[in-house]
Interface confidence: low
């Protein structure tokens, strides 16, 4: 009720002779601050005096002075909420009731705390979980209802008297609720810990023994077994007998059932501690163990590997890898069941023994086509030699070999012929599936590996083919050697270098670009007339009559080719000049007379000059000289001169006669 002082502290505190006691304590007074505090030992209320009688362990006065003999007991509190006390050292006769007599200005209160001091250090208490199973982590707790700042202690764990190597966690509590020291140890017990003694030892700061508590571990575990075999190495031959015995070395709780396992599978009707195997076969090789169960579960013995020895079985060959590419590496593995493992191997290639090969693996670092075939092996151990199995096939793949391009036509090939070529090869793996040709052309492939060139060109020089499987192999190019008539025949003037003038020395060359075969003949022709059979046509002194259209022909055994007509032009000064008169050389006066200067010239006459009978040049320069009206005095001899870039030429005299008209005669 509200008339009470409120105190909080442990109900009872424990200690032992010579140790100390620390009493955590809080309070709340009814009114005001604390004015007086007395600590009684076993206080008794005296009704007569209305005061408490008993041994006064501590007393504080209003002036705050404490008698010097009170140093063993200390009030560590204050005037309003802390009432903590310390007794150091504590003695056996301090046991009993401590009374805290508190007085404020108007109120008084007696608070009682029990103190239990033993003669010797009392033992801690070990707390265990209700059940401990092997390999399951448990926490062991050691609890001591004591803690005091002035008296350090430690708790140590021992297993069969030996300190435990697991780290323990120690905690202390000095609170108004509880006072204790606790050590917790996390521990995974094994079956071998069953029945062992665990001790929690209380020690002082120097490690001196003070007290302890012990417990015996009850570790539940599956049966622990030992297997024994005769013969001890568990190596036998087919037909021998084998005995295996199972012994239980520990079980908690007691075991209930027994069974035997081979390679993890239970053997039927084998429920005793002895397993007898009579006249063993190689199939009975394997890992054996016995299994015994209890309420915790089944326990298994270590495995015994029973080896039933036998000669190698027929072998098989594994190839890494087939098909193999030429030049790659291949490994062969001989596989044969045998016990003991084969010590020697004999290898065969296509039925022939492979010398010097006695190991389980054969490695060929660089495969060649002739390595292809069937590989088999025979394994051998101390008990005998196995049989040769069916073997494995090595397929060696490689590009087509020895590829050649073959011309099927009769030779020689002529321009315009149809040429057939075939692509041949010696061997190929895998088979050839396609062919390629160089150079590419709009050619026909009538069948695989055959090329038909219609109307073969003169310039089809070489053809090469490739036979292809996964790879292409090219043949060396083959020359078609196409024969053709001479090509690009033309006439070329060699000399003179400039234009041809009459009288010059002239050479014409008959050129052609190519001819196959090389042996050729030449023919020169002018106006259908054969002029010569040399490559050159020569004129020592060319004349205008030599001008004209020339052609040359070149022929070989295949045919002949003509050049385009080539015009030979001869330049010469005007010649064969003559003066012609129209209407005639006799003209009546008053009429019209036309004199024409006719000439032969190349280039044509560019300039004419007219002369009279006195060699007097006339002021006329055209080809025609027109006299109109003609006069009698025009009568006389006329001549003309023609000029071109080459030179000049003159005509002979031509006489014009102008006669009188009848009128004139009549006048006379």
């Amino acid at each position: 009720d509200s008339s009470k002082w409120v105190f909080e502290h442990p109900e009872t505190l424990y200690a032992w002779e010579g140790a100390c006691v620390w009493i955590p304590c809080t309070y709340r007074a009814l009114d005001g601050d604390l004015e007086s505090f007395i600590l009684f030992h076993n206080p008794e209320y005296n009704k007569n005096t209305s005061k408490f009688d008993g041994t006064r362990l501590y007393e504080s006065t209003k002036d705050g002075k404490v008698p010097s003999e009170q140093k063993r007991v200390q009030f560590l509190g204050d005037k309003n909420k802390n009432c903590t006390l310390s007794i150091h050292p504590v003695h056996l006769n301090d046991s009993g009731q401590l009374g805290l007599r508190m007085e404020s200005k108007t109120e008084k209160w007696m608070e009682r705390i029990h103190l239990n001091v033993s003669e010797r250090p009392f033992p801690p208490h070990i707390q265990l979980p209700p059940e401990i199973q092997e390999s399951q982590e448990v926490t062991l707790t050691c609890l001591l209802n004591f803690s005091c700042y002035g008296y350090p202690i430690q708790l140590q764990w021992l297993l069969e008297g030996v300190p435990m190597r697991q780290a323990a966690v120690t905690s202390t509590s000095l609170t108004i609720k509880s006072v204790f020291t606790r050590s917790e140890l996390k521990f995974s017990p094994q079956w071998s810990h069953h029945g062992k003694i665990v001790t929690c030892q209380l020690q002082d700061a120097d490690g001196k023994f003070l007290s302890n508590d012990t417990v015996q571990l009850n570790v539940k575990h599956t049966p622990k077994l030992e297997i024994k075999v005769t013969p001890s190495d568990a190596i036998v031959r087919e037909g021998d007998s084998v005995t295996m015995t199972c012994e239980v070395s520990s079980s908690n709780p007691e075991y209930t059932t027994v069974s035997w396992l081979k390679d993890g599978t239970s053997l039927k009707k084998q429920n005793t501690f002895t397993l007898n195997l009579r006249e063993v076969t190689k199939d009975q090789s394997g890992k054996y163990c016995c299994q015994v169960s209890n309420d915790v579960g089944p326990g298994r013995s270590e495995e015994v590997f029973l080896q039933v020895q036998y000669a190698p079985e027929p072998s098989t060959v594994q190839i890494l890898h087939s098909p193999a590419v030429e030049g790659s590496q291949v490994e062969f593995l001989c596989m044969s069941l045998a016990n003991p493992l084969p010590t020697n191997y004999t290898w065969y290639h296509n039925g022939k023994e492979m010398q010097g090969r006695t190991e389980e693996k054969v490695h060929i670092p660089k495969i060649l086509p002739w390595h292809a075939g069937t590989y088999s092996c025979v394994a051998e151990n101390i008990l005998g030699t196995g049989q040769r199995g069916p073997g494995a096939e090595l397929d060696v793949q490689y590009p087509p070999k020895k590829v050649t391009t073959v011309i099927q036509n009769p030779m020689p090939i002529r321009e315009g012929d149809t040429v057939t070529l075939s692509c041949n090869y010696n061997s190929s793996n895998p088979s050839v599936t396609r062919y390629e040709w160089k150079p590419h052309g709009a050619w026909e492939e009538p069948s695989l590996g055959v090329l038909k060139i219609q109307n073969v060109g003169w310039d089809n020089t070489t053809i090469a083919c490739a036979a292809c499987n996964s790879w292409c192999s090219w043949a060396s190019p083959v020359a078609l050697n196409v024969q053709y008539a001479p090509r690009d025949v033309r006439v070329r003037k060699i000399k003179p270098l400039s234009e041809i003038h009459s009288g010059n020395s002239v050479s014409l060359q008959c050129d052609f670009s190519s001819s196959h075969p090389k042996e050729v003949q030449f023919f020169w022709e002018k106006n259908g007339r054969l002029l010569g059979k040399e490559s050159q046509l020569n004129f020592d002194s060319i004349s205008p009559e030599d001008a004209g259209s020339y052609s040359c022909w070149v022929n070989n055994s295949i045919g002949q080719t003509a050049s385009k007509a080539w015009t030979l032009e001869v330049l010469y000064a005007p010649r064969r000049l003559r003066v012609s008169m129209s209407p005639g050389d006799q003209v009546m006066e008053g009429k019209s007379a036309t004199l024409t200067c006719e000439s032969d010239a190349n280039p044509p006459v560019s300039h004419y000059t007219w002369f009279d009978w006195n060699n007097q040049s006339l002021p006329y320069h055209s080809q025609k000289l027109r006299l109109e009206p003609v006069k009698v005095q025009h009568s006389g001899a006329y001549w003309c001169q023609g000029t071109n870039s080459v030179g000049k030429g003159r005509s002979p005299l031509s006489t014009l006669t102008v006669y009188y008209s009848p009128e004139t005669i009549g006048r006379r």
């Epitope: 590496q329 492979m354 010398q355 010097g356 190991e359 490695h363 060929i364 670092p365 660089k366 060649l368």
Partner: antibody, heavy 124, light 113 residues
């Protein structure tokens, strides 16, 4: 017993030619790779040429490549070495050798059997 | 080409002594695929053809006395003759069979004191 007998020894002028033969007996000749090995007057051993059991693969030392030709005639159990463009440095005792087994990676290995040798002298 | 160096070039021993000769290659003769060393040893007695003693560095050819022991790996190899006999007087050659061209050492001449 394996027996290898070389023949064809002779004195040849530089640039000349010579053909060596090796008659084999006591084993299945067609199953074994064969080599020619020579020993110089200074006692140095030099591998010259090699031919596989099928004759499909042939190897030569660089010093004789293009001048010497190794061949075999399995019907006659005979190995040949055709030597042309001979040089003075080809002077040596030429041994016919059988490879360790008919089969070993298609390349020469070690020489299990040797003939008695035939002497080739190249001198002007 | 793989170069083979033999040492010593000659040695003189008494009957019953242990003989050791060495052969060094310019590159490793150990095959990574089968862990074998591709090296052979030959014996050539005066006036005779060479005779195979050891292959794969340590495998003795059948019929070869067990006093001849080949050892070594990679680039360094040894031929040991335990308790040398008078009939062991000969030239000894090592040869690599790792790659073509096959090459021989210049030889070690064993003479008797």
């Amino acid at each position: 017993d394996v027996k290898l007998v070389e023949s064809g020894e002779g004195l040849v002028k530089p640039g000349g030619s010579l053909k060596l033969s090796c008659a084999a007996s006591g084993f299945t000749f067609s199953s074994y790779a064969m080599s020619w090995v020579r020993q110089t007057p200074e006692k140095r051993l030099e591998w010259v040429a090699y031919i596989t059991s099928g004759g499909d693969y042939i190897y030569y030392a660089d010093t004789v490549k293009g001048r010497f030709t190794i061949s075999r005639d399995d019907a006659r159990n005979t190995l040949y070495l055709q030597m042309s463009s001979l040089k003075s440095e080809d002077t040596a005792m030429y041994y016919c050798t059988r490879d360790q087994g008919y089969y070993y990676d298609g390349r020469p290995t070690w020489f299990a059997y040797w003939g008695q040798g035939t002497l080739v002298t190249v001198s002007a | 080409d793989i170069v083979m160096i033999q040492s010593p070039s000659s040695l003189a021993m008494s009957v019953g002594q242990k003989v050791t000769m060495r052969c060094k290659s310019s590159q490793s003769l150990l095959s990574s695929s089968n862990q074998k060393n591709y090296l052979a040893w030959y014996q050539q007695k005066p006036g005779q053809s060479p005779k195979l003693l050891v292959y794969f560095a340590s495998t003795r050819e059948s019929g070869v006395p067990d006093r001849f022991i080949g050892s070594g790996s990679g680039t360094d190899f040894t031929l040991t003759i335990n308790s040398v006999q008078a009939e062991d007087l000969a030239d000894y050659f090592c040869q690599q069979h790792y790659s073509t061209p096959l090459t021989f050492g210049a030889g070690t001449k064993l003479e008797l004191k």
